[in-house]
């Protein structure tokens, strides 16, 4: 019999709107930011089945906003749950001159302010050693279908959700589940969570694949220990 | 339409725990949107928010009362509680249970109360 | 704790008069997360305004909210017979997670 005491499950009901506070902030780089909230006591776990994601609910300039964020933390943390998020500031990009609704109402926010999570969404489920159920729409039941080797393509914070899936494959010894994932960003210091990516190609050679594709290349010489750069992003249009 | 109703006893001795009940008709209390939330006035004063509760049973608290604090729901009643610990005289007042379902989807203010109950601690 | 002070704590007019009540808060309120309440003698409080500026379902257009930041306002165009009772405003977010002023009592002069 398993001995060990279930934890209290924060998303319980998928509809409901639970308020967690922010409990850390980290800044990543000039734009990226690790948001760490707290649950509802130090027991409880996010209850996020790997594949699927949280929506962040807030009133800004007087309408409801929702975003969906995919955290970089999992249920092994108890207490809080992480989100590496960035920031699009007003100002920046010509094309979105008020930038990030959200995302700058997360970064304004204080140490101690809630918002109101929402979850789990999502029509991934990845079930153990290449087990997948995708649902063709969000109310329809999971279609099963087993994979070998999953190929994924993510771009900046598009990162996160291929991390919770690298993360929870790499973590059991028994998931031989091969993975290729191309990871584009703009330019080197731009890569998020590349020490640990690197880190799970170099102990995991004949699993995971990483290869870089950067907008703007470094000058010098390239040094990635497990990890390939491409030339640049226009080798996959 | 809805209504709460508070019921418990209206004295309690000092050192005693304090054990409310609210029943909820016109609606069900399995909502997701719902929270139901406690919120005591002392004689003559203001209000203040002891704690709230969702169906699933996951609970907020003031921290001014987290440690003697306890809310439970009971859905298959339409029911939630309020029990309070370790009571003195500073817990006396009127209790009132009260649903935020929240304007614009989110539950940030109380748009349904109850009348209230008084509890009075006492020897 | 983002604490709430009421001003002033009596307000004392007659029927028909305007009645301005203040809420300030001690840290920054998200304008979206503010609430009136109004509560006569003897009864529950019922919620008038939300979100600092929507009225609750069935409240007079007399009542209105306004503000931002830190600083909010009731406003009673007309007062009437009704309207003498008191008042509180309540902030969502932060620890604990709803605070609520004082309150203003309005009474007839």
């Known amino acids: 019999m398993n001995s060990r005491r279930r934890e209290p499950i924060t998303l319980q009901d998928p509809e409901a709107k639970y308020p967690l506070p922010l409990i850390e902030k980290e800044k990543i780089s000039h734009n990226t930011r690790r948001f760490r909230f707290g649950l509802p006591s130090p027991d409880h776990v996010l209850g996020l089945p790997v594949g699927n994601y949280v929506q962040l609910l807030a009133k800004i300039d007087n309408e409801l906003v929702v975003r969906a964020y995919t955290p970089v933390s999992s249920d092994d943390d108890r207490g809080f749950v992480d989100l590496i998020i960035k920031i699009y500031f007003k100002n920046v990009h010509p094309q979105y001159p008020e930038g990030g609704k959200m995302t700058q109402y997360l970064e304004n926010m204080k140490i101690g302010e809630t918002i109101f999570f929402r979850g789990p969404r999502g029509r991934l489920f990845y079930h153990g050693p290449g087990n997948l159920g995708i649902r063709p729409d969000q109310t329809s039941e999971p279609k099963k279908t087993l994979a070998d080797h999953l190929g994924m393509i993510a771009g900046g914070t598009g990162i996160t959700p291929m991390l919770q899936l690298i993360r929870h494959i790499t973590k059991d010894p028994s998931d031989r589940t091969r993975m290729s994932l191309i990871f584009a960003n703009q330019t080197e210091e731009d890569i998020l969570v590349r020490k640990e990516l690197e880190e799970i190609a170099r102990t995991h050679p004949d699993q995971f694949d990483l290869w870089y594709t950067l907008d703007r290349p470094p000058i010098g010489p390239w040094s990635a220990e497990g990890a390939t750069l491409l030339s640049n992003s226009a080798q996959f249009h | 339409q809805l209504q709460l109703q508070e019921s418990g006893p209206g004295l309690v001795k000092p050192s005693e725990t304090l054990s409310l009940t609210c029943t909820v008709a016109?609606?069900?209390?399995?909502?997701?949107?719902?929270?139901w939330a406690w919120i005591r006035q002392p004689p003559g004063k203001g209000l203040e928010w002891i704690g709230s509760i969702i169906h699933t049973g996951t609970t907020y608290h003031n921290p001014s009362l987290r440690s003697r604090g306890t809310i439970l729901v009971d859905t298959s009643k339409n029911q939630f509680s309020l029990k309070l610990s370790s009571v003195t005289a500073a817990d006396t007042g009127l209790y009132y249970c009260?649903?935020?379902?929240?304007?614009?989807?989110?539950?940030?203010?109380?748009?349904?109360w109850g009348q209230g109950t008084l509890v009075t601690v006492s020897s | 704790e983002n604490v709430l002070t009421q001003s002033p704590g009596t307000l004392s007019l007659s029927p028909g008069e305007r009645a301005t009540l203040s809420c300030r808060a001690s840290?920054?309120?998200?304008?979206?997360?503010l609430a009136w309440y109004q509560q006569k003698s003897g009864q529950a409080p019922r919620l008038l305004i939300y979100?600092?500026?929507s009225r609750a379902t069935g409240i007079p257009d007399r009542f209105s909210g306004s503000g931002s930041g830190t600083d909010f306002t009731l406003t009673i165009s007309r007062l009437e017979p009704e309207d003498f009772a008191v008042y509180y405003c309540?902030?969502?977010?932060?620890?604990?997670?709803?605070?609520f002023g004082p309150g203003t009592k309005v009474d007839i002069k």
């Open positions: 016109g609606d069900s209390i399995s909502r997701s949107n719902y929270y």
């Open positions: 840290q920054r309120v998200n304008s979206n997360y």
């Open positions: 009260a649903r935020h379902s929240g304007h614009d989807q989110l539950p940030l203010d109380f748009d349904n």
């Open positions: 309540q902030q969502y977010g932060g620890s604990p997670l709803f605070t």
């Open positions: 979100g600092a500026s």
